[in-house]
């Protein structure tokens, strides 16, 4: 039985041109995380964090994606096209795979606030 829980930053908004932290956290399990994959709404891989090998940022995102904090991801120079779903996939053993979802809305407005509350999807 998979006992763990993925907590994510949930639904967040950020300003165009700004940056945002995408954060997932796996809790309530002793499972060993072998790899965390970060995917965009169109299922393209942004980055991989492997326990043995460290971070790999995919070439298409190298200029705009920074690893961390922790197993999270920082998206920079946001454009309106960045609006959409983001997924963190935790590959673990013995539990198997855990998946978390974050929805990012990029706003033109200068009053856009980056809400970073944690919630369980």
């Amino acid at each position: 039985m998979m006992t763990g829980t993925i907590e994510t930053t949930g639904n967040i908004s950020a300003k165009k041109g700004g940056s945002v932290i995408l954060q997932c956290h796996l809790s309530s399990t002793m499972a060993q995380v072998t790899q965390v994959n970060w995917e965009q709404h169109d299922h393209s891989l942004l980055a991989i964090r492997n326990a043995e090998l460290g971070w790999h940022i995919y070439p298409a995102f190298k200029d705009r994606v920074a690893p961390g904090p922790g197993l999270g991801l920082t998206l920079q120079s946001l454009t309106m096209n960045d609006t959409g779903e983001y997924f963190c996939t935790y590959h673990t053993y013995p539990d198997g795979t855990y998946r978390g979802r974050i929805f990012l809305e990029v706003l033109e407005s200068s009053v856009a606030e980056h809400s970073a509350r944690f919630q369980i999807p």
Epitope: S27, E52, P94, G96
Partner: antibody, heavy 118, light 112 residues
Framework: EVKLVESGGGLVQPGGSLKLSCVAS????????MSWVRQTPEKRLELVAE????????YYPDTVKGRFTISRDNAKNTLFLQMNSLKSEDTAMYYC???????????WGQGTLVTVSA | DVLMTQTPLSLPVSLGDQASISCRSS???????????LEWYLQKPGQSPKLLIY???NRFSGVPDRFSGSGSGTDFTLKISRVEAEDLGIYYC?????????FGGGTKLEIK
């Protein structure tokens, strides 16, 4: 090279306390679940404590629950085992161990001996 | 708890012989993920245990190919095709498909 070095063992009286340490090197300590395993004088192996990579989750078998506390300092690459209310049956060699490649105890330290005796 | 029973307790062999150690679990150790998390360790005299086999049949890095693991469900076997002097020690099976994770009692491989 993965290296795990335990320390802190020794002779302690029943009811006493001891704190074991395990210093890790050669890998990203904060990425791994870590465990303490003990081996009794009769050579039986028993998992006594586990802690998740962040330190947020811990596990203990009933034999040590409420007496032992596992913790970690990821900034110092160090794993700890605080042992209280020690009993003669806690006498054992204590090893820290790390998973890897789909295995639970891929790497072991050299061990530190704990003797509980009056 | 999953009880891991190893047989025999002691296994006297001649160098060059094949050795076989059995490990039986009190219930299936197939994890919900479909994997069977059964491992074999060797503890040589005066040393800490070392991983030989993981997930039933996968040799850990640096482990000679004379060691092989097999089995499924509740019955598992470690075979050493040609025993060498450096293989002597205590062999343990271990499962982590279920909590609490449990070891077998050990099998001592010794010279006949």
């Amino acid at each position: 090279e993965v290296k795990l070095v335990e320390s802190g063992g020794g002779l302690v009286q029943p009811g006493g306390s001891l704190k074991l340490s395990c210093v890790a090197s050669g890998f990203t300590f904060s990425s791994y679940t870590m465990s303490w395993v003990r081996q009794t004088p009769e050579k039986r192996l028993e998992l006594v404590a586990e802690i998740s990579s962040s330190g947020g989750s811990t596990y203990y078998p009933d034999t040590v629950k409420g007496r032992f506390t596992i913790s970690r300092d990821n900034a110092k690459n160090t794993l700890f085992l605080q042992m209280n209310s020690l009993k003669s049956e806690d006498t054992a060699m204590y090893y820290c161990a790390r998973p890897g490649l789909g295995a639970w105890f891929a790497y072991w330290g050299q061990g530190t001996l704990v003797t509980v005796s009056a | 708890d999953v009880l891991m029973t190893q047989t025999p307790l002691s296994l006297p062999v001649s160098l060059g012989d094949q050795a076989s150690i059995s490990c039986r679990s009190s219930q299936s150790i197939v994890h919900n993920s479909g994997n069977t998390y059964l491992e074999w360790y060797l503890q040589k005299p005066g040393q800490s245990p070392k991983l030989l086999i993981y997930k039933v049949s996968n040799r850990f890095s640096g482990v000679p190919d004379r060691f092989s693991g097999s089995g499924s469900g509740t019955d598992f076997t470690l075979k050493i095709s040609r025993v060498e002097a450096e293989d002597l020690g205590i062999y343990y099976c271990f499962q982590f498909s279920h909590v609490p994770r449990t070891f077998g009692g050990g099998t001592k491989l010794e010279i006949k």
